[in-house]
């Protein structure tokens, strides 16, 4: 699976929140930045996650009319140089400062059952997702016997009208 | 080669059904969200309805919702349009479309050369 | 839901002239944008994908631009064999069709 292209095709700025309205928030600690899932207090302002947005071609056998085979692999950003990260050892998802290019583990597959509503399937760990756990992010081991719309791993990308991330 | 071939068009009372099917090659079918588009004679576009790749997510527009139903199978590559309780404005030749992506409803990359549905008494 | 607006309904212009037609959505939808191009009796196909990304076999006279609700598409040198209606469509919330742009040559 590789990406076809070193740059995005298209960039989308977002707060993002579980299934259940629950808030994605990050915070600096000790020159670290953790994630929480959290309830946030009413109008309190929605942490914003630069969503990066890359064509991937899929090894397959397909051939025709140059459209098949291809995925969508995102990158999430909630702050400058950072990136979510995939730590399959640890099943867990961290922010990692990078620079470019990317390591694989900063690049999900884009699962979306619209109205917003998205899954993010890691690129080094097919069948694995991020979901939440004990409100955290984490690596969940989703079987393909089961539906995608299970809830721990569907998020909701809600626009917002600000044009700066960083 | 992508080939979408729509079946089951035809001349049909208000009030009766319709069951519109698109049989797909060239793809990994089971990878792809599916979706029907509409459009009446001399008219633009209407998306009708989709559904994604593991057929558990099916969507509908407004005017259809409770009448139509759209289903897939994908171990024959096919995908469906039950239309109840037609009427008159469902008139329109209903064209079939694949995703752009795997498992994305983003975009429709591909269309079946469509089949056209009349409703009339 | 959101509401897509073309302008203008018909457009008739040179062989060779740069052409631009326009599409207004009711609401952000973030480069969420597709442009379909539909000939007289023939299926649509894709043109343009998240508002600037030129489908794989389409000649690159073709280019779209655009963010928030404005989006164009801009055929850079319009040729006989562009005669279509021209279609752009949303898909950041449902999905919408614009009413389409009928595109003559004069």
């Known amino acids: 699976m590789s990406i076809t292209g070193i740059s995005p095709i298209t960039e989308y700025l977002a707060s993002l929140s579980t299934y259940n309205d629950q808030s994605i928030t990050f915070a600096l600690e000790d020159e670290s930045y953790e994630i929480y899932v959290e309830d946030l207090k009413k109008d309190e302002k929605k942490d914003k996650v630069l969503l990066s947005y890359y064509e991937s071609q899929h090894p397959s056998n397909e051939s025709g009319d140059g459209v098949d085979g291809k995925m969508l692999m995102v990158t999430l950003s909630p702050t400058k140089d950072f990136w979510l990260h995939a730590n399959n050892k640890e099943h867990s998802v961290e922010l990692h400062k990078s620079e470019k290019p990317l390591p694989d583990q900063a690049f999900f597959v884009l699962h979306n059952m619209h109205s917003n509503s998205v899954s993010f399937e890691s690129k080094t760990d097919p069948g694995v997702f991020i979901g939440v756990k004990d409100n955290h992010l984490a690596l969940i081991k989703v079987d393909s016997s089961e539906n995608l719309s299970t809830e721990n791993i569907l998020f909701k990308l809600s626009e917002t009208h600000h044009h700066h991330h960083h | 080669e992508v080939q979408l071939v729509e079946t089951g068009g035809g001349l049909v009372q208000p009030g009766r059904s319709l069951k519109l099917s698109c049989v797909a090659s060239g793809f990994t079918f089971s990878n792809y969200w599916m979706y029907w588009i509409r459009q009446a004679p001399g008219m633009g576009l209407e998306w009708v309805s989709s559904i994604n790749n593991d057929g558990g997510n099916t969507y509908y527009l407004d005017s259809v919702k409770g009448r139509f139903t759209i289903s897939r199978n994908n171990a024959e590559n096919t995908v469906y349009l039950q239309m109840n309780s037609l009427r008159s404005e469902d008139t329109a030749t209903y064209y079939c479309a694949k995703g752009h992506y795997y498992y994305s409803s983003y975009s429709f990359a591909f269309w079946g050369q469509g089949t056209l549905v009349t409703v009339s008494s | 839901d959101i509401q897509m607006t073309q302008s203008p309904s018909v457009l008739s212009a040179s062989v060779g002239d740069r052409v631009t037609l326009s599409c207004k959505a009711s609401?952000?939808?973030?480069?969420?944008l597709d442009w379909y191009q539909q000939k007289v009796g023939e299926a649509p196909k894709l043109l343009i994908y998240f508002t600037n990304n030129l489908q794989t076999g389409i000649p690159s006279r073709f280019s779209g631009s655009g963010s928030g609700t404005d989006y164009t598409l801009t055929i850079s040198s319009l040729q006989p064999e562009d005669v279509a209606t021209y279609f752009c469509?949303?898909?950041?919330?449902?999905?919408?069709f614009g009413q389409g742009t009928k595109v003559e040559i004069k």
């Open positions: 609401h952000n939808i973030n480069k969420h």
């Open positions: 469509f949303q898909y950041n919330s449902g999905w919408t």
